[in-house]
């Protein structure tokens, strides 16, 4: 499985609440001995490896905020410690995993990371994370709401889009190129055949310059089948970092469909043993 971040940037006014979301993609093992450990923490930009540094969220460590549940279960942090700090992490049946932060302050701005670990009977098998940025803005009216978007480093988007585009164009053009090469070779061999015929009859006629010869179209050449025009659909694609990239950087982000809206599950599932205070 992989972790995707539906949005990589959240911009919120002070005092608002925000729900940061990660989503599990791909097949998830739901065997009886498979469980998932999920948590959130803060990190810092400019690292060699994103999310490698771990910092607490409002003084709560990754272990304070963790969920641990079976592959078929939903869960949420029900202990008082997180709620006293205005935090709640939750996980639903559809692979959505979120942290809700209430009453945002400027100090909450920064890079947030989600971590998901697949555990198979006591053994940590698979660890993946996602990253997103939260920007809390001062002096906004309490009526305004948070904006979530996929804005990222435009250079990396352009590079990714160009690379993807070049690959697609290359793959689509390959049959066409091969066809043209085949045609060219057919035409060339036809010309050679005609020249040989002329050379045979040159005893009675003078040698003509083949360069000025206007060859009639060769009837034996198979016609290239007409193709329908190619349509290029821009869509969000998961990148290696778990973020979504636009295939076409100029395409605006489409609004989330009904399935994209995430409501954290609030089924009370008690917390697990925890090294930190519960």
């Amino acid at each position: 499985f992989k972790v995707a971040t539906p949005y990589s940037l959240y911009v919120c006014p002070e005092g608002q609440n925000v729900t940061l979301t990660c989503r599990l993609l791909g097949p998830v093992d739901k065997g009886h001995d498979v469980t998932f450990y999920k948590t959130w923490y803060r990190s810092s930009r400019g690292e060699v490896q994103t999310c490698s540094e771990r910092r607490p969220i409002r003084n709560l460590t990754f272990q304070d905020l963790h969920l641990h549940h079976g592959g078929h279960q939903a869960a949420n942090t029900s202990h008082d410690l997180a709620q006293r700090h205005g935090l709640e992490s939750a996980s639903d049946h559809h692979g959505n995993f979120s942290i809700t932060m209430r009453n945002l302050t400027l100090l909450d701005s920064g890079l947030y990371c989600c971590l998901v670990v697949e555990i198979r009977h006591h053994h940590s098998e698979h660890r993946v994370h996602g990253a997103m940025e939260l920007q809390v803005q001062a002096g906004k009216g309490s009526g305004s709401t948070c904006m979530a978007s996929n804005e990222q480093d435009s250079d990396s988007i352009t590079a990714a889009a160009l690379a993807t585009g070049a690959c697609i164009v290359g793959i689509l053009c390959l049959p066409l190129i091969l066809l043209l090469v085949y045609k060219q070779r057919q035409v060339a061999s036809h010309r050679r055949a005609q020249e040989l015929v002329r050379m045979d009859s040159s005893n009675t006629q003078g040698i003509e310059n083949p360069g000025f010869e206007t060859t009639p179209p060769f009837q034996g050449m198979p016609e290239a089948k007409t193709r329908p025009p190619l349509s290029y659909v821009a869509q969000r694609q998961p990148s290696e970092s778990g973020r979504y990239l636009l295939s076409d950087p100029s395409t605006p982000l489409s609004p989330p469909g009904p399935g994209d809206v995430f409501f954290p599950s609030l089924d009370p599932v008690p917390d697990s043993p925890n090294s930190e205070a519960i």
């Epitope: 469980t35 948590t39 963790h66 641990h68 940590s124 008690p270 697990s272 925890n274 090294s275 519960i278």
Partner: antibody, heavy 121, light 106 residues
Framework: QVQLQQSGAELMKPGASVKISCKAT????????IEWVKQRPGHGLEWIGE????????NYNEKFKGKATFTADTSSNTAYMQLSSLTSEDSAVYYC??????????????WGQGTLVTVSA | QIVLSQSPAILSASPGEKVTMTCRAS?????MHWYQQRPGSSPKPWIY???NLASGVPARFSGSGSGTSYSLTISRVEAEDAATYYC?????????FGGGTKLEIK
């Protein structure tokens, strides 16, 4: 705060059976494996086996099959280990430990204080 | 079963010294856990997943290794570090511990 409280020391006769208890508090007892570990005086730690209280699932070290039997009572948050046909080789401190998943890595996160079992004629 | 062999069995060091103890596995492992047991006490979780310190463990402790060879290092030994240290694998049943390295402070 997570705590595992074990029953007191036992002095047993060879051939007898003993049942050790481990009462858990501070977490959801049914969802985490309880591990049992043996430590003989001057020896290292030896894993006996485990029980998942919520389902009653058990796993045993082959060496202790027939010697140890695990049970759990979720109503009292207590796990039990019964040792049968005791010999002097069974004289040891027995620990219960709760699995903890820390940073996504399960390990023996919490330990009881240990129960000393002495087998003597 | 996976056998974990710890060496040395006994390690004697003076305060301030750097010490390293090793744990070798009979089969390759993804990671190793370490526990500290002081005399007369229960074992305590100490280092998880090869190199990560448990909450409250002093920063002078570190862990490293991969495959079949793992080690625990104390950069500057202190009197309170006197204990037996056990490595443990949770990769395959039966889950096993090493024989332990007893650290004595001179």
């Amino acid at each position: 705060q997570v705590q595992l409280q074990q029953s007191g020391a036992e002095l047993m006769k060879p051939g007898a059976s003993v049942k050790i208890s481990c009462k858990a508090t501070g977490y959801t007892f049914s969802r985490y494996w309880i591990e049992w570990v043996k430590q003989r005086p001057g020896h290292g730690l030896e894993w006996i086996g485990e029980i998942l209280p919520g389902s009653g699932s058990t796993n045993y070290n082959e060496k202790f099959k027939g010697k140890a039997t695990f049970t759990a009572d979720t109503s009292s948050n207590t796990a039990y280990m019964q040792l049968s046909s005791l010999t002097s080789e069974d004289s040891a401190v027995y620990y219960c430990a709760s699995e903890e998943v820390y940073d996504g890595y399960p390990w023996f996160g919490y330990w009881g204080q240990g129960t000393l079992v002495t087998v003597s004629a | 079963q996976i056998v974990l062999s710890q060496s040395p069995a006994i390690l004697s060091a003076s305060p301030g010294e750097k010490v390293t103890m090793t744990c070798r596995a009979s089969s390759s492992l993804s990671y190793m856990h370490w526990y500290q047991q002081r005399p007369g006490s229960s074992p305590k979780p100490w280092i998880y997943a090869t190199s990560n310190l448990a909450s409250g463990v002093p920063a002078r402790f570190s862990g490293s290794g991969s495959g079949t060879s793992y080690s625990l290092t104390i950069s500057r030994v202190e009197a309170e570090d006197a204990a037996t240290y056990y490595c443990q694998q949770w990769s395959s049943n039966p889950y096993t511990f090493g024989g332990g390295t007893k650290l004595e402070i001179k």
